[in-house]
C-alpha cells in the first residue's frame, strides 16, 4: 500500500562489502527479492539475495571482492535496486544512488586482549578489521564495561575521540569478574554510523593481596 | 526543511500531454530524491514516479511507464514530469514531494517528509 512503511538503507564496510536491510510493512514473508548493485565507473555489478530477518524484513550483503580490497572509492555513487519476484516478473521496489563513503559502518573491532591486568586497573587492545587506509586516522571509537549485577545497556559509554586501539580501565573493583567491548565509527559520511559491538572480551581484575590496602 | 511548488496542471483532451514542474527551495535541493504522487476524487493518493538526486535512477508505478517520464535540473531546483498519452483515469491532484534523508526511493509516502500544495490535472474524453 502507497501509505505505508518501505525502508532500504545499505551501509559500506569501507573495503568490499555493502550489507543492506530492505523493510516493507504487510509484505509476504516467503516474497523472492534480490538487490542489484551497479557502480557508476567500475566494470562490475553485484547482486545479492535478500533473506528474511524479521516478519517485514529482509537483508543481504553484497560481496564486492576480497575482504581487504579497495573496490570503491570517495568519488564513486553506486545504483543499489531492490527487485521483488511478482508471477514472472522482476519489479523494482526500491531505488537508491548510493554514495559509499557517506554511509559507512565498519566491521566490528577485533583481537581484543588483555594486554595487563592489576587489582584496580586493567590495559585492554584490539585492532580494526577491514577498515579503508582513506580514513588515516580519522576514526573514533566507544568503549564500555559489563560490572557485575548490570547490563550491557547500563554501562557508560567511554569515548575515544581519536584512532587509540587501546585503553586503560581505572578504578575496577580487585578480584572481579568484567566484560569489554567496543566498537568504531569514521568521522567521514552525513549517514556513517556505529560499527557492530566487538565481541566481548571476559576478565578477571587480581585480587587484593592480603593485609594490604590497595 | 523543503519547500516544493508544483506547476503545469490544466485541462488536456485525452490523448493530450502535459508538464508538471516542481520547484524547489531549501536543503540542498542536490542530493534530494522527489517523488511524484497523484489523488484522484475519492481515492487514495498514489505513487507515480520518482527521480534520484543524481538522475542516474527513475522509478514509475506500472500504471504510467511508458507514457510519463520523470527528469530533473539540478541547477535551476526543479523536477519534471512529462505526461503523454494522457488518459480520463490520469485526472488528480498531482504532488510532488522529498524523499526524506538518508532514504531510498520508494512507492510509499512514508519515505517522503516534505510534500507540495499540489496542481490539478484534469483530462477530458
Known amino acids: 500500500a502507497v501509505n505505508g512503511t518501505s525502508q532500504f538503507t545499505c551501509f559500506y564496510n569501507s573495503r568490499a562489502n555493502i550489507s543492506c536491510v530492505w523493510s516493507q510493512d504487510g509484505a509476504l514473508q516467503d516474497t523472492s527479492c534480490q538487490v542489484h548493485a551497479w557502480p557508476d565507473r567500475r566494470r562490475w555489478n553485484q547482486t545479492c539475495e535478500l533473506l528474511p530477518v524479521s516478519q517485514a524484513s529482509w537483508a543481504c550483503n553484497l560481496i564486492l571482492g576480497a575482504p581487504d580490497s579497495q573496490k570503491l572509492t570517495t568519488v564513486d555513487i553506486v545504483t543499489l535496486r531492490v527487485l521483488c519476484r511478482e508471477g514472472v516478473r522482476w519489479r523494482v521496489m526500491a531505488i537508491q544512488d548510493f554514495k559509499p563513503f557517506e554511509n559507512l559502518r565498519l566491521m566490528a573491532p577485533i583481537s581484543l586482549q588483555v594486554v595487563h591486568v592489576e587489582t584496580h586497573r586493567c590495559n585492554i587492545s584490539w585492532e580494526i578489521s577491514q577498515a579503508s587506509h582513506y580514513f588515516e586516522r580519522h576514526l573514533e571509537f566507544e568503549a564500555r564495561t559489563l560490572s557485575p549485577g548490570h547490563t550491557w545497556e547500563e554501562a557508560p559509554l567511554l569515548t575515544l575521540k581519536q584512532k587509540q586501539e587501546w585503553i586503560c580501565l581505572e578504578t575496577l573493583t580487585p578480584d572481579t569478574q568484567y566484560e569489554f567491548q567496543v566498537r568504531v565509527k569514521p568521522l567521514q559520511g552525513e549517514f556513517t554510523t556505529w560499527s557492530p559491538w566487538s565481541q566481548p572480551l571476559a576478565f578477571r581484575t587480581k585480587p587484593a593481596a592480603l593485609g594490604k590496602d590497595t | 526543511q523543503v519547500q516544493l511548488v508544483e506547476s503545469g496542471g490544466g485541462l488536456v483532451q485525452a490523448g493530450g500531454s502535459l508538464r508538471l514542474s516542481c520547484a524547489a527551495s531549501?536543503?540542498?535541493?542536490?542530493?534530494?530524491?522527489v517523488g511524484w504522487f497523484r489523488q484522484a476524487p475519492g481515492k487514495e493518493r498514489e505513487f507515480v514516479a520518482a527521480?534520484?538526486?543524481?538522475?542516474?535512477?527513475?522509478l514509475y508505478a506500472d500504471s504510467v511507464e511508458g507514457r510519463f517520464t520523470v527528469t530533473r535540473e539540478n541547477a535551476k531546483n526543479t523536477v519534471y514530469l512529462q505526461m503523454n498519452s494522457l488518459k480520463p483515469e490520469d485526472t488528480a491532484v498531482y504532488y510532488c514531494?522529498?524523499?526524506?534523508?538518508?532514504?531510498?526511493?520508494?512507492?510509499?509516502?512514508?519515505?517522503?517528509?516534505?510534500w507540495g500544495q499540489g496542481t490539478q490535472v484534469t483530462v477530458s474524453a
Open positions: 527521480i534520484t538526486w543524481s538522475s542516474h535512477s527513475t
Open positions: 531549501g536543503r540542498t535541493f542536490s542530493t534530494t530524491d
Open positions: 514531494a522529498a524523499v526524506r534523508r538518508g532514504w531510498a526511493v520508494v512507492r510509499t509516502e512514508g519515505a517522503y517528509d516534505f
